[in-house]
């Protein structure tokens, strides 16, 4: 069961896996959650009754019964991992720890104006896990305003000590705030010849890349496929690093694949969730249980529901044996990966889906698109919402997109004349406007946050957030869309769609069924030529056909320009303005969302 509260002055006895150092019990719980085996932990807080060498220790524990005996101990704080919980989990830690020096390998020292600048520097440095910053009040003159960037093998400090007038904190890479490039390509027939920091077994290069992404020291990887000539290295995933952060040598080798950590795009790509099945593949590991199951899907469900299960192998039933049920082998290992992978034995293997909640909900695959036609089908654009105003009478006002369980992203110009959020209603999971009746459930709006530089749509900053009064429970028909990664600024999106209930031509009415149109992006240079009287800034993005004919129009405002990239949908634009609708050589102009990621995160993650 899910236990979120911390147990003060309590110590769990036994079950130790490893000890790490964390600045708080809260962060110890996060570390436990992300550790492949940890189910419980005991943290020792700073206390006069405790030996200072034990302060800030976070002992990660495991137990077959999922619990351990409790002992009273002053300054000890214990708790359970969030693995047992169904809620969304994030490793993002924005806390700043005052008067704590988090020890690690100090590899960079520079002057910074503030702790925030130091944290930003850490976030944008490929090696940095955490930092310590000496404030202006630090006794040593030469160290004042010094920002020390640090890394360790585990990503957590090797020790934490009290030091007056310093502050420490973690990289915000896991908060989606890094400006580092996001290189998603996997390079076939390539070996990166740099130092290995670890090696694990993986069924394919994609799983290897995901493991690299959440390994604290891994910057890039090489995977040897099952056709690799050296048998002992087949399915081997080598996790690598280098001083420069890039591979120093690439060697052409058949049957090997290489790629990069997706650390700086992990909020818009699944990195924990290995959802595929691997046929004719057996995963070896420590056996947890053997259960009868009807199918490999059922076996995966059993593994997902068993908190200690990390991966499984299903052997289908032989003919009419055992009521058609096969054997489901639930397994685990010290690092969450199989200890060996065998092929040709007829098994079907896969991983627990328990870790999927550590990925952003927006990365979940949605129904396949309906090709052709202009009317959408239910669940095709589950992030699309219709924003209604109730004054003077109820009507569709604008589109919007779900980007979090309490947040809608839309256009600022939608709120011209809107005096209060009380008159707004957000409807999600809607296909036809006619579905909206008196008793249709909606989300009230608690707050309208308009970008403070917004004046009018044509001059940019046409972006607004709606904070909902209640949270959205994600389902197939209502779920978030990923924000683009800052590291993805150079991505060329080729599969972009605009959706909305807006007019189909300039003089028209709101449509009943949600409309969709595939529209190509237009370069800003090209767009500027079409709008000589306006300034098309880098904070805008344009889309449209040269000949016109397909475009967003009145009523689509605030809705998404959604682009699919690497199987994940990204909110690339917000419908903003244009000259007429679908006119020849007049592309639609959209708010370029990637340029506002910091603003969105600042507003939505504010304490």
């Amino acid at each position: 069961e899910c236990v979120t509260q911390l147990l003060k002055d309590t110590c769990f006895e036994g079950g130790d896996i490893t000890t790490v150092f964390t600045p708080s019990a809260k962060y110890c719980q996060v570390v436990c959650t992300y550790h492949p085996r940890c189910l419980l932990f005991t943290f020792t807080a700073e206390s006069p009754s405790e030996d200072p060498t034990r302060w800030f220790t976070c002992v990660l524990k495991d137990s077959v019964t999922e619990t351990l005996p409790r002992v009273n101990r002053t300054a000890a704080i214990s708790g359970y991992s969030f693995k047992q919980c169904s809620h969304q989990i994030s490793a993002c830690n924005k806390d700043i720890y005052v008067d704590l020096d988090m020890k690690g390998i100090n590899y960079n020292s520079s002057v910074a104006k503030s702790a925030q600048e130091c944290q930003e520097r850490c976030t944008d440095d490929v090696h940095c896990h955490f930092f310590t910053y000496a404030t202006r009040q630090f006794p040593s003159l030469e160290h004042r305003n010094i920002c020390l960037l640090k890394h360790t093998q585990t990503g957590t400090p090797t020790r934490i000590t009290k030091l007056d007038k310093v502050v420490s904190g973690f990289s915000l890479k896991s908060c989606a705030l890094s400006n580092l490039a996001c290189i998603r390509d996997i390079f076939p027939n390539t070996v990166f010849a740099d130092s290995n920091i670890d090696s694990v077994m993986a069924p394919d290069a994609f799983v290897c890349g995901r493991i690299c992404t959440h390994h604290p020291g891994c910057l890039f990887f090489t995977f040897f496929s099952q056709e690799w000539p050296k048998e002992s290295q087949r399915n081997l995933c080598l996790l690598k690093t280098s001083e420069s952060g890039l591979p120093s040598t690439r060697i052409k080798k058949s049957k090997a694949l290489s790629g990069f950590s997706l650390q700086s795009c992990r909020h818009s790509i699944p990195v924990f969730c290995h959802s595929s099945f691997y046929h004719d593949t057996d995963f070896l590991g420590e056996e947890l249980d053997i259960v009868a199951a009807k199918s490999h899907e059922a076996c995966q469900k059993l593994c997902t529901n068993a908190v200690r299960c990390q991966f499984f192998t299903y052997t289908p039933a032989q003919a009419s044996c055992n009521e058609g049920k096969g054997k489901c082998y639930l397994k685990l290992s010290s690092n969450g990966s199989p200890t060996k992978i065998l092929h040709g034995r007829g098994g079907i293997s896969g991983y627990t889906l328990r870790l999927c909640k550590m990925d952003n909900e927006c990365t979940t695959k949605i129904k396949p698109r309906i090709v052709g036609g202009t009317a959408s089908v239910r669940g095709e654009w589950p992030w699309q919402v219709t924003l209604h105003t109730t004054s003077p009478t109820q009507r569709h006002l604008c589109g919007g997109s779900i980007i979090g369980n309490q947040w809608i992203l839309t256009a600022a110009h939608c709120f011209y004349g809107v005096e209060s959020p009380k008159i707004l209603r957000v409807y999600s999971g809607i296909l036809n406007q006619s579905e909206i009746k008196e008793d249709t459930s909606f989300f009230g709006v608690q707050e309208i946050i308009i970008h403070d530089q917004y004046k009018m749509a044509e001059s940019g900053y046409d972006i607004a957030l709606l904070k909902l009064e209640t949270t959205v429970n994600y389902t197939d028909s209502q779920r978030p869309i990923c924000l683009p990664s800052k590291g993805d600024r150079n991505v060329i999106y080729t599969d972009c769609w605009v959706t909305g209930w807006g007019y189909r031509k300039l003089r028209d009415k709101i449509q009943n069924t949600l409309q969709k149109a595939k529209i190509p992006l237009v370069t800003n240079e090209e767009c500027q030529k079409r709008y000589r009287g306006h300034k098309i800034t880098h904070k805008m993005i344009c889309a449209g056909y040269r000949e016109g004919g397909k475009d967003a129009c009145k009523g689509d405002s605030g809705g998404p320009l959604s682009c699919k990239h690497n199987e994940v949908w990204h909110l690339v634009g917000i419908t903003s303005w244009g000259e007429g609708c679908a006119q020849r050589e007049r592309p639609g102009v959209y708010t370029n969302v990637v340029e506002y990621v910091d603003w969105i995160l600042e507003k939505t993650q504010a304490v």
Epitope: D101, N106, N108, S109, S110, V111, T132, A134, F138, P139, S140, L141, E142, H143, I146, L148, L163, V166
Partner: antibody
């Protein structure tokens, strides 16, 4: 062993510039700050400024602001101090001295390694 | 800037005797103070930092004390090699400043 080796003595005319070098060895050059201190004949020590060899950031004493420039070359582990618009009162022995270890935070330190000094004579 | 004043300017002591040198700061420098020894024709040598911590290789006869504005360097039993000029220096604020020095000579 850790040492700082400075360039040789210089004789300059008033109004000219002088550039003194200080080559570090035996330690990680970019991990420590470097100070420049001068001593006029028969006088005490006078601090001129500091350079952080890692990023190249500098801080100068007000008295020398606008006349002194401290630079570094990480490839040769050398720091330079250039003093322009020389006058006779700039006649002194110029020392480079290693300062704080910047890769670790601690409260107290001193200038623990000094160069042998470079005599600069300004005379018409 | 912080003005460092050393006294006396000259101290005449016999070998084997105790020498006490003073350094006063015009405002508090906490414990951010160092002491140096300089012999004729040589570069200064760090003796004490943090007001009281001996630098590597410095004999135990050298000790430092004080904090805030008043500091003392004590040489418990003067050896012949200790006759030199001693400078204090504050590390509390820019610009760094040195005292005028105390010359310790043989009595």
């Amino acid at each position: 062993q850790v040492q700082l080796v400075q360039s040789g003595a210089e004789v300059k005319k008033p109004g000219a510039s002088v550039k003194v070098s200080c080559k570090a060895s035996g330690y990680t050059f970019t991990s420590y700050s470097m100070h420049w201190v001068r001593q006029a004949p028969g006088q005490g020590l006078e601090w001129m400024g500091i350079i952080n060899p890692s990023g190249g950031s500098t801080s100068y004493a007000q008295k020398f602001q606008g006349r002194v420039t401290m630079t570094r070359d990480t490839s040769t582990s050398t720091v330079y101090m250039e003093l322009s618009s020389l006058r006779s009162e700039d006649t002194a022995v110029y020392y480079c001295a290693r300062g704080a270890y910047l890769m670790e935070l601690y409260y107290y330190y001193g200038m623990d390694v000094w160069g042998q000094g470079t005599t600069v004579t300004v005379s018409s | 800037e912080i003005v460092m004043t050393q006294s006396p300017a000259t101290l005449s002591v016999s070998p084997g005797e105790r020498a006490t040198l003073s350094c006063r700061a015009s405002q508090s420098v906490s414990s951010n103070l160092a002491w140096y020894q300089q012999k004729p024709g040589q570069a200064p040598r760090l003796l004490i930092y943090g007001a009281s911590t001996r630098a590597t290789g410095i004999p135990a006869r050298f000790s430092g004390s004080g904090s805030g504005t008043e500091f003392t360097l004590t040489i418990s039993s003067l050896q012949s090699e200790d006759f030199a000029v001693y400078y204090c220096q504050q590390f509390n604020d820019w610009p760094l400043t040195f005292g005028g020095g105390t010359k310790v000579e043989i009595k």
